[in-house]
C-alpha cells in the first residue's frame, strides 16, 4: 500500500489532523522535501546576523554576517568578529601579528613568513604584518644559461 | 603552470619609450609578486621591477624614476613603462611571476634594443 503522504509535495507537509490531506506549510515555515508530515521553522537572521536570502515554503532562510563579522561554521552557524589586516583575534580581542609572522585577511590567524632558504630562494621583499616575504627565483634560474621556459616544479612529498 | 606571454618589445632610440605587457593564464593575484627580469648577453638575469599583491613595487636602482610597473588586475596583466631609455636598457626582458611555495614561472622574454 502507497503511503498517501509521498505524494505530498515540498511545500506542504502531511496533515494527520485532516485525513493526511497535502496541506502548505504555514507561514515562516518549509518543507524542502514531498511526503513530510511536519514544516521545519524557518530560521530568523537576527542580531548580528542578517539576512541573505529569505525563507519560502520550500527552503530555509540563509543567513550571513552583519559588516565586521564574517560568518564560521556549516551555514553560517555563527558569526565571528573582524579583524584588521595583520592582526589575528583572540580571547581578548584583535592583536597584532607577532614580528616574523603575517595575517593577509580580515580573519584567520597570523602566519609565519616564509623562509625562504629552505627551498634556496633568497627574499626579495620583506614582510610586514600584513604580506608575506616574495621569495626570489632560485639562484639556477638567474645565471646567463638559465633557460625562460621553466619545467613544473617536481611534486613535493607530503608532510614537506 | 601558468603561461605568461610578453609583448611590446623592439628597437628604440636613446631617450624613446617602451611599454611591455605580460599576459598571464591565471588570476595573478594567486602569486606572491609579479616581475619583470632582463638578461643582456653573457650577463647574469637581473631583477628590474615586481609588484606584489597589495600593490607594494620593488626597483632596481638603475631605472628608479625612469621604469614603472603596474598591474591591470581585470586583465591579469603587469605593464613595464619604460622611459628614458638608455643603452645599457638593451637585454631580453622576461615576466616573471614568483610563488613562495612554487618554482618561478618565466614568460619566453621578449627583446629591448636601445641604439644610441
Known amino acids: 500500500l502507497q503511503d498517501p503522504c509521498s505524494n505530498c509535495p515540498a511545500g506542504t507537509f502531511c496533515d494527520n489532523n485532516r485525513n493526511q490531506i497535502c496541506s502548505p506549510c504555514p507561514p515562516n515555515s518549509f518543507s524542502s522535501a514531498g511526503g513530510q508530515r511536519t514544516c521545519d521553522i524557518c530560521r530568523q537572521c537576527k542580531g548580528v546576523f542578517r539576512t541573505r536570502k529569505e525563507c519560502s515554503s520550500t527552503s530555509n532562510a540563509e543567513c550571513d554576517c552583519t559588516p565586521g563579522f564574517h560568518c564560521l561554521g556549516a551555514g553560517c552557524s555563527m558569526c565571528e568578529q573582524d579583524c584588521k589586516q595583520g592582526q589575528e583575534l583572540t580571547k581578548k580581542g584583535c592583536k597584532d601579528c607577532c614580528f616574523g609572522t603575517f595575517n593577509d585577511q580580515k580573519r584567520g590567524i597570523c602566519r609565519p613568513w616564509t623562509n625562504c632558504s629552505l627551498d634556496g630562494k633568497s627574499v626579495l621583499v620583506n614582510g610586514t604584518k600584513e604580506r608575506d616575504v616574495v621569495c626570489g627565483p632560485s639562484p639556477a634560474d638567474l645565471s646567463p644559461g638559465a633557460s625562460s621556459v621553466t619545467p613544473p616544479a617536481p611534486a613535493r612529498e607530503p608532510g614537506h | 603552470q601558468v603561461q605568461l606571454v610578453e609583448s611590446g618589445g623592439g628597437l628604440v632610440q636613446a631617450g624613446g619609450s617602451l611599454r611591455l605587457s605580460c599576459a598571464a593564464s591565471?588570476?595573478?593575484?594567486?602569486?606572491?609578486?609579479m616581475a619583470w627580469y632582463r638578461q643582456a648577453p653573457g650577463k647574469q638575469r637581473e631583477l628590474v621591477a615586481l609588484?606584489?599583491?597589495?600593490?607594494?613595487?620593488k626597483y632596481a636602482d638603475s631605472v628608479k624614476g625612469r621604469f614603472t610597473i603596474a598591474r591591470l588586475n581585470a586583465k591579469n596583466t603587469v605593464n613595464l613603462e619604460m622611459n628614458s631609455l638608455k643603452p645599457e636598457d638593451t637585454a631580453v626582458y622576461t615576466c616573471?611571476?614568483?610563488?613562495?611555495?612554487?618554482?618561478?614561472?618565466w614568460g619566453q622574454g621578449t627583446q629591448v634594443t636601445v641604439s644610441s
Open positions: 591565471e588570476n595573478i593575484f594567486s602569486f606572491n609578486a
Open positions: 609588484i606584489t599583491g597589495d600593490g607594494t613595487t
Open positions: 616573471a611571476a614568483l610563488r613562495n611555495s612554487d618554482r618561478t614561472s
